[in-house]
């Protein structure tokens, strides 16, 4: 990806109930499988159609999973992270970080890239300023007519 990619970062607690075929998603990442450069975190790489996560609707591909049932996912080997999900029980609480791309392309979830986020006011202030300038220019133009 060329240029800078900026994200709005939000966190959410997602409570899933394990379905007949499990939780219904795939993960990448871990200290031995860095999916995002300089980040050994655990990311959602696939949501299984009609699985528990898909039916709940909140977990998205590209989300970073911070903890499972309160257990931090930092500094885990990939397979250890997989095993943590497998042994998480029937009711599973996920602390999830959503990253929404806000510049440098269409808005959407991203599975890879710069994991850092920017505050929403950094986006809104320039938009507001541009709107004010446009309104002022429009008023000046009307006065000249």
């Amino acid at each position: 990806m060329n240029g800078r990619v900026d994200y709005l970062v939000t966190e959410e607690e997602i409570n899933l109930t394990r379905g007949p075929s499990g939780l219904g998603f795939n993960i990448v990442g871990g200290t031995d499988q860095q999916y995002v450069s300089n980040d050994s975190g655990i990311y959602v790489s696939r949501i299984k159609e009609n699985g528990a996560a898909a039916l709940d609707g909140r977990l998205q591909e590209g989300d970073k999973i911070l903890s499972v049932n309160g257990q931090d996912l930092k500094n885990l080997l990939h397979q250890d992270a997989v095993d943590l999900f497998r042994n998480a029980g029937y009711a599973v609480s996920l602390r999830v970080q959503h990253r929404l791309q806000v510049q440098n392309g269409p808005i959407g979830h991203r599975g890879e890239g710069d994991p850092s986020g920017i505050p929403i006011f950094m986006v809104l202030v320039p938009v507001f300023a541009l709107t004010m300038v446009a309104a002022w220019a429009f008023m000046r133009y009307r006065q000249q007519l």
């Epitope: 075929s21 795939n26 990448v28 499988q33 959602v44 790489s45 696939r46 997989v82 497998r86």
Partner: nanobody, 125 residues
């Protein structure tokens, strides 16, 4: 998107061997779960085996005869088929999913895979 291209199929006598290859695109190939499936005329698609981050597994019908391996440097997965039988005749497909399932060690359901190759014909006479 991930592209998968199988090769290595052909006609072989019973008791013979073949090695199928599946070349994949994508810079995160090492994270892929890769499966082999086969489909004989008039039959449903059948799981042959899979290889994940942690290991590989094959179906009972081919255990001891077929092995799966991968070369992450070449973005390629292999299916080594020995002691071939006429009932192994089928179109063989390579399939991929990004990442590891949190639900199953070795996914055998075709619905667990998002990307599929075009298939390569194996005929055992």
């Amino acid at each position: 998107d991930v592209q998968l291209v199988e090769s290595g199929g052909g006609l072989v006598q019973a008791g013979g061997s073949l090695r199928l290859s599946c070349a994949a695109s994508g810079r995160t190939f090492s994270t892929y779960t890769l499966g082999w499936f086969r489909q004989a005329p008039g039959k449903e698609r059948e799981f042959v085996g899979t290889i994940t981050w942690s290991g590989s597994s094959t179906a009972d019908s081919v255990k001891g005869r077929f092995t799966i391996s991968r070369d992450n440097a070449k973005n390629t997965v292999y299916l080594q088929m020995n002691s071939l039988k006429p009932e192994d005749t089928a179109v063989y497909y390579c399939a991929a999913a990004i990442g590891s399932s949190v639900d199953s060690d070795y996914p055998s359901d075709p619905l667990e895979y998002d990307y599929w190759g075009q298939g390569t014909q194996v005929t055992v006479s």
